[in-house]
């Protein structure tokens, strides 16, 4: 298991929520990617492909949760003061080989300005 | 402990159908892809069919295309192989085998867990 | 189809010698999508070795995986008894498909 802080932007703040942006290589074919807040998953999903190339994801801890060819970007929204806290993205790769769990991570820090029902 | 058991097996004749089951335990069935892989007595191996973790994705063998379905009840945490129009040289001890990773995915992964078999004989 | 040719067919061993298995496909296995498996008489096959070098949980480290491209081996460090069986390799990309295999016995 491979553990490191994100050499990336991971948090992209809009509209009271945020991105929580967990990247993967262009090679990988078949995993599965964790959101962990501390130890805790907060969301799951796994992509595995079938013959023609036929995608299928499966999402066990339901997020909203976007794909790109790169990337699973996970949505936590209504943010407080509470969703401060280290995030990681567990990614599991199946597909090439050898099978490898990476581990990257950062802090969301919370602002008054970045809360969704902020009182004027 | 991880458990595997097939079942449906026996002796059918040329043009017959059988379906055969394997029944988990010990594992979250869900979380894995599962293949058939068949072995005639004192020979080699041989991959029939897979199937992903909800039945979207399936391949097959060319040997056995168009003759064989792939199936499973997540409910039941089983697996089924529907046979039909079998011929002599579908004999053989039939295995079930789930995806070495817990990926979900029968497509490019290995099998660890397997079954005990069970035999199908195609005579007349 | 990837063809997959085993050598040799059987290697007459001691216990405590080495055991050298070679696997040479038809065409290049992509990203090392190889597998060995161990088959006992009465039992299921018993997975080895994945990605041509990785050990499968709980494989004890006598057995180590190598190759790439056309041509694999499964070495044995130093056989023991229960080591005696039939060994099978794998490419699994795409349809899989086994090899003949290798019986290793008693000399």
């Known amino acids: 298991e491979i553990n490191g802080s994100a050499n990336y932007e991971m948090f992209i703040f809009h509209n009271g929520g945020v991105q929580i942006l967990c990247k993967y290589p262009d090679i990988v074919q078949q995993f599965k990617m964790q959101l962990l807040k501390g130890g805790q998953i907060l969301c799951d999903l796994t992509k595995t492909k079938g013959s023609g190339n036929t995608v299928s994801i499966k999402s066990l801890k339901f997020c909203h949760s976007q794909l790109s060819n790169n990337s699973v970007s996970f949505f936590l929204y209504n943010l407080d003061h509470s969703h401060a806290n280290y995030y990681f993205c567990n990614l599991s790769i199946f597909d090439p080989p050898p099978f490898k769990v990476t581990l990257t991570g950062g802090y969301l820090h919370i602002y008054e300005s970045q809360l969704c029902c902020q009182l004027k | 402990e991880v458990q595997l058991v097939e079942s449906g097996g026996g002796v059918v004749r040329p043009g017959g159908s059988l379906r055969l089951s394997c029944a988990a335990s010990?594992?979250?069935?869900?979380?894995?892809?599962m293949s058939w892989v068949r072995q005639v007595p004192g020979k080699g191996l041989e991959w029939v069919s897979g199937?992903?973790?909800?039945?979207?994705?399936?391949d097959y063998a060319d040997s056995v295309k168009g003759r064989f379905t792939i199936s499973r009840d997540n409910a039941k945490n089983s697996l089924y192989l529907q046979m039909n129009s079998l011929r002599a040289e579908d004999t053989a001890l039939y295995y079930c085998?789930?995806?070495?990773?817990?990926?979900?995915?029968?497509?490019?992964?290995?099998?660890?867990?397997w079954g005990q078999g069970t035999l199908v004989t195609v005579s007349s | 189809e990837i063809v997959l040719t085993q050598s040799p067919g059987t290697l007459s061993l001691s216990p405590g010698e080495r055991a050298t298995l070679s696997c040479r496909a038809s065409?290049?296995?992509?990203?090392?999508?190889l597998a060995w498996y161990q088959q006992k008489p009465g039992q299921a096959p018993r997975l080895l070795i994945y990605g041509a070098s990785s050990r499968a949980t709980g494989i004890p480290d006598r057995f180590s995986g190598s190759g790439s491209g056309t041509d694999f081996t499964l070495t044995i460090r130093r056989l023991e008894p229960e080591d005696f069986a039939v060994y099978y390799c794998?490419?699994?990309?795409?349809?899989?498909?086994f090899g003949p295999g290798t019986k290793v016995d008693i000399k």
């Open positions: 199937i992903n973790w909800n039945g979207d994705n399936t």
């Open positions: 085998a789930r995806d070495y990773y817990g990926s979900g995915s029968y497509y490019n992964v290995p099998f660890d867990y």
């Open positions: 010990g594992l979250t069935f869900d979380d894995y892809g």
């Open positions: 794998q490419q699994y990309g795409s349809s899989p498909f």
């Open positions: 065409q290049s296995v992509s990203s090392s999508y």
